[in-house]
């Protein structure tokens, strides 16, 4: 397994609708035709997998139908969007990139993007 540099923003603020987007960029050490991208969430020293997708160059990233993630790819950049976030989902979201084909296998893990999610205030009842 060979190491590869992965860059991602340090901080992102989710929208009021609970949507957060960030770019995950990897420094490909050579030709890559198949790439696997995994988003990990680290909170309280626990790491869980949020979503993952394998894509062949020239294709869109396809996450599972029930995934909270969507994404697009362009060259060595992956634009990731996570939706349905609540305040309790605030945490460090780490981008992991694997170059699956052709060999050799490369693995890169970003430093993480701290996503802050603030639940919207409920609207006060209005009298008409």
């Amino acid at each position: 397994c060979k190491a590869m540099h992965v860059a991602q923003p340090a901080v992102v603020l989710a929208s009021s609708r609970g949507i957060a987007s960030f770019v995950c960029e990897y420094a490909s050490p050579g030709k890559a035709t198949e790439v696997r991208v995994t988003v990990l969430r680290q909170a309280d020293s626990q790491v869980t997998e949020v979503c993952a997708a394998t894509y062949m160059m020239g294709n869109e990233l396809t996450f599972l139908d029930d995934s909270i993630c969507t994404g697009t790819s362009s060259g060595n950049q992956v634009n990731l969007t996570i939706q349905g976030l609540r305040a309790m989902d605030t945490g460090l979201y780490i981008c992991k990139v694997e170059l699956m084909y052709p060999p050799p296998y490369y693995l890169g893990i970003g430093n993480g993007t701290q996503i802050y999610v603030i639940d919207p205030e409920p609207c006060p009842d209005s009298d008409f």
Partner: antibody
């Protein structure tokens, strides 16, 4: 010795579909991508797409999306390409070509399948 | 898509002559990550499938005679045959191997007098 044995020539009517095969031997089928290449008579080569025989994921040249469908049968080490809604423009020789084991460029080719579309 | 352009489209030479043919790509095939050029050369003889001659712009495929030499970097590449033999009668194609979609040049047809 790596061998890619392709199915024989076909004559089909416009609007029909055709499915050709490429049987691989002499290596581990699931380890290397299989590419498909089109060559119209007297013309250059066009890359149609590639498939990963391990999981069936594929990538297509935009020009051939909707025209070609790539599949594999791991149990028989065979790759397939289906072409649909055929027109005279699809008359050509179609090659399967394996990614090489050292440099991952197309270094082993089938003998080609000739497709003629005519009414 | 990367466009590959080859010249000349055809040339006629005598056995023993030195031949050079050119291939240009619309964007660089030099990968910044490993400094490799992702360009391949193929030879296609009449009624046969293409055969890989050169990969990585300059590395000869196993079994290819050393009279075939590939050179160049970035967007400009050359295939040289130092002393043409009768069996070299073929069409020679260059191919962008940098990434999908792979693209080929229009070919250079080599004919022997």
């Amino acid at each position: 010795e790596v061998q890619l044995q392709q199915s024989g020539p076909v004559l089909v009517k416009p609007g029909a579909s055709v499915k050709m095969s490429c049987k691989a031997s002499g290596y581990t089928f699931t380890d290397y991508y299989m590419n498909w290449v089109k060559q119209s008579h007297g013309k250059s080569l066009e890359w149609i797409g590639a498939i990963n025989p391990d999981h069936g994921g594929s990538s297509y040249n935009q020009k051939f999306k909707g025209k070609a469908t790539l599949t594999v049968d791991k149990s028989s080490s065979t790759a397939y390409m289906e072409l649909n809604s055929l027109t005279s423009e699809d008359s050509a020789v179609y090659y399967c070509a394996r990614d090489g084991s050292i440099h991952y460029v197309m270094d082993d080719w089938g003998q080609g399948t000739s497709v003629t579309v005519s009414s | 898509d990367i466009v590959m352009s080859q010249s000349p489209s055809s040339l006629t030479v005598s056995a023993g002559d030195k031949v050079t043919m050119s291939c240009k790509s619309s964007q660089s095939l030099l990968h910044s990550g490993n400094q490799k050029n992702y360009l391949a050369w193929y030879q296609q003889k009449p009624w046969q499938p293409p055969k890989l001659l050169i990969y990585g712009a300059s590395t000869r495929e196993s079994g290819v005679p050393d009279r075939f030499t590939g050179s160049g970097s970035g967007t400009d590449f050359t295939l040289t045959i130092s002393s043409v033999q009768a069996e070299d009668l073929a069409v020679y194609y260059c191919q962008n191997d940098y990434g999908y979609p792979y693209t080929f040049g229009g070919g250079t047809k080599l004919e022997i007098k």
